[in-house]
């Protein structure tokens, strides 16, 4: 007998989600309009392509990357899409309200959709730490809180630290990682007896997770270059990200083999480590002056990622209740920090070169900015975790963790699909 979607959630989820969608539609009706300018059509297509790359990364890349659980692959992919769709809508409104609302209307451009997709991507990174332990109603809450927190963080950083779009969006790695880890810390941790098999990876879902990793790998240069202000910077960002992810793939596969006593390659290590270079160069991808430096960073990031994947899951499983295959959270937290450190080092080298005696000031501001991102991520993550623990959401029972059958209708009730 298949376990039915809990009765209370069957009432709660559609009501909650559709009411929210109706509210969003009303907000769009009253407060938004499209950019009226007659753009150059070629430019419009080019601009749309970047947004399309980001959507592919989010929907296919992150959707499939989190689908490696034996009995939770359907939910991983579909819930990711649900969160992306909801997150983009709320992010567009929020960004408009925070940045351009005094004019009375929020103007929607392809750039604002690009920005919103990147904001929603933050949720998809964070959710890796909690997927399988929450239902859709809870994920709606998570989307709303995280997108709001990230939007406000970006506005505060922009105003206080005078950072541009690229710089304040590149905190997404660290922010999303710490947000997800703090939410996971609040949720019921122990995996009850009888569910150990469910958080294990299976061959076919693992293959789809690899497919997700491949899509992310292909489009990461678009992500790192999407918000830069000039074609020179975008070109540098694309090149440097490409070199970094290329090297991190080689490092991930060889490092994974090195880390295993029999020299075997771990699927889980490879899934996340192939992306390591892209995360590590994200903040400074437009500044790196030559390919070799990007490649060295890709190498270091790949090694850190494999090392982290080998030694951190035990700790994360015990303390945060995160399964071994959900390593995106701590991976991104380490690599995001690495990226921020690299940016500060480059800043210092530039300042020393210019001889303008501003090193202390710059380092202090950069550390302040990073600290603010981490603090807001942890605080909003803990708040979300506490909210998700409320009985109103009818969270899945621990015995139903990592189980597609709780949420999906399977005509033949197969267990090992």
């Amino acid at each position: 007998m298949s376990s039915k979607y809990p009765r209370s959630v069957r009432r709660c989820l559609p009501l909650w989600a559709l009411t929210l969608e109706a509210a969003l539609i009303l907000l769009f009706y009253f407060f938004t309009h499209y950019d009226a300018s007659l753009e150059d059509q070629k430019g419009l297509v080019a601009s749309y392509q970047v947004g399309q790359d980001l959507t592919v990364m989010a929907a296919i890349g992150l959707g499939f990357l989190t689908s490696s659980f034996r009995r939770h692959s359907w939910s991983s992919v579909a819930f990711n899409l649900f969160m992306l769709a909801l997150g983009v809508q709320w992010a567009i409104l929020l960004d408009g309200f925070l940045s351009q609302f005094p004019s009375g209307k929020v103007v929607i451009t392809l750039f604002s959709i690009r920005l919103a997709t990147m904001s929603a991507l933050s949720v998809l990174i964070s959710v890796d730490a909690v997927l399988g332990k929450v239902n859709l109603a809870q994920l709606v809450v998570m989307v709303l809180v995280e997108v709001t927190a990230l939007g406000n963080l970006r506005m505060v950083i922009s105003n206080i630290f005078n950072t541009d779009y690229h710089m304040n969006m590149m905190h997404i790695y660290v922010f999303a990682a710490y947000f997800g880890l703090s939410v996971a810390w609040c949720l019921p941790k122990p995996l009850p007896e009888g569910t150990e098999d469910k958080d294990q990876t299976a061959t076919i879902p693992s293959l789809s997770a690899m497919l997700g990793a491949l899509f992310l790998w292909m489009f990461w240069p678009s992500f790192n270059s999407a918000l830069l202000r000039s074609p020179i910077e975008r070109k540098n960002a694309v090149f440097n990200t490409y070199y970094a992810v290329a090297v991190s793939v080689v490092t991930a596969i060889s490092g994974s083999s090195l880390a295993h006593p029999q020299g075997k390659i771990s699927k889980t290590y490879v899934h996340s480590a192939v992306l390591a270079g892209g995360v590590a160069v994200g903040t400074s991808c437009h500044l790196i002056p030559s390919p070799w430096l990007a490649m060295v960073l890709g190498l270091v990031a790949g090694l850190i990622s494999v090392g982290g994947a080998k030694y951190l899951p035990g700790c994360c499983n015990r303390v945060l209740g995160i399964p071994h295959s959900s390593i995106m959270g701590y991976n991104f937290s380490l690599l995001g920090l690495l990226g921020e450190i690299i940016y500060i080092v480059l800043l210092v080298l530039d300042t020393v070169g210019a001889g303008n005696g501003m090193i202390g000031f710059q380092v202090l501001l950069s550390i302040g900015e990073l600290s603010l991102a981490i603090v807001i991520a942890l605080m909003s993550g803990l708040l979300t975790g506490l909210l998700l623990n409320l009985k109103i959401w009818k969270a899945p029972h621990e015995a139903k963790y990592f189980d597609d059958q709780v949420f999906w209708k399977f005509p033949h009730l197969a267990v090992g699909f």
């Epitope: 005078n162 500044l287 790196i288 480059l346």
Partner: antibody, heavy 129, light 112 residues
């Protein structure tokens, strides 16, 4: 040499619309952000709007928000300013200007954007009934 | 918005004498990268503005070395070491740190 030529100005009644154009030559137009700046008769300079090199992002002065729209056609090397619901206080000489940046990093390839470096000769818009 | 205040608004100078124009901003224009996002523009009668000094102290190409910019944070100065007749113009400071970009009211330099 680098040149910006504005056109489209004229006399218009309050509440009506006008579209200004700025033709660029002598540089790779599609690689630069562009601005509109205006100067009311006998007054100082007032920044109106900026658009990124690919048209992706735009910013406006409070006085222009909701009424003016900056756009560009990179295939024609042309910048536009669509002005709707014009008011008497919009009477001014309108200049287009190129976004200025300098490569500053000795170690990195850091670009610093600081304002406008090249200006057009301006086109006059008079809003009067 | 960042408010830019120039002084004096009118500056009569004898040819060959030095001249100094002050510009103050309501917020610091010193960016974390160490640059001050302040530019000086001059506008000769009947002409469009042209860039004189950028990022606080850098002369634009073709600008004579008698023009110099200094200052940091909120207080900036444009100096002309020896005024010439052709320097008669309006001088504007502008902050390029954040949008909306804002200009000072302008200083009219005239020959005594």
């Amino acid at each position: 040499q680098v040149q910006l030529v504005e056109s489209g100005g004229g006399v218009v009644q309050p509440g009506r619309s006008l579209r200004l154009s700025c033709a660029a030559s002598g540089f790779t137009f599609s690689s630069y952000g562009m601005h509109w700046v205006r100067q009311a008769p006998g007054k100082g300079l007032e920044w109106v709007a900026v658009i990124w090199f690919d048209g992706g992002n735009k910013y406006y002065a409070d006085s222009a928000k909701g009424r003016f729209t900056i756009s560009r056609d990179n295939s024609k090397n042309t910048l536009y300013l669509q002005m709707n619901s014009l008011r008497a206080e919009d009477t001014a000489v309108y200049y287009c200007a190129r976004d200025a940046s300098v490569l500053s990093g000795l170690v990195t390839r850091r670009l610093v954007y600081y304002g406008m470096d090249v200006w057009g000769q301006g086109t006059t818009v008079t809003v009067s009934s | 918005d960042v408010v830019m205040t120039q002084s004096p608004l009118s500056l009569p100078v004898t040819p060959g004498e030095p001249a100094s124009i002050s510009c103050r901003s309501s917020q610091s224009l010193l960016h974390r990268n160490g640059y001050n996002y302040l530019n000086w523009y001059l506008q000769k009668p009947g002409q469009s503005p042209q860039l004189l000094i950028y990022l606080g102290s850098n002369r634009a190409s073709g600008v004579p070395d008698r023009f110099s910019g200094s200052g940091s944070g909120t207080d900036f100065t444009l100096k002309i070491s020896g005024v010439e007749a052709e320097d008669v113009a309006f001088y504007y400071c502008m902050q390029g740190l954040r949008t909306p970009y804002t200009f000072g009211q302008g200083t009219k330099l005239e020959i005594k």
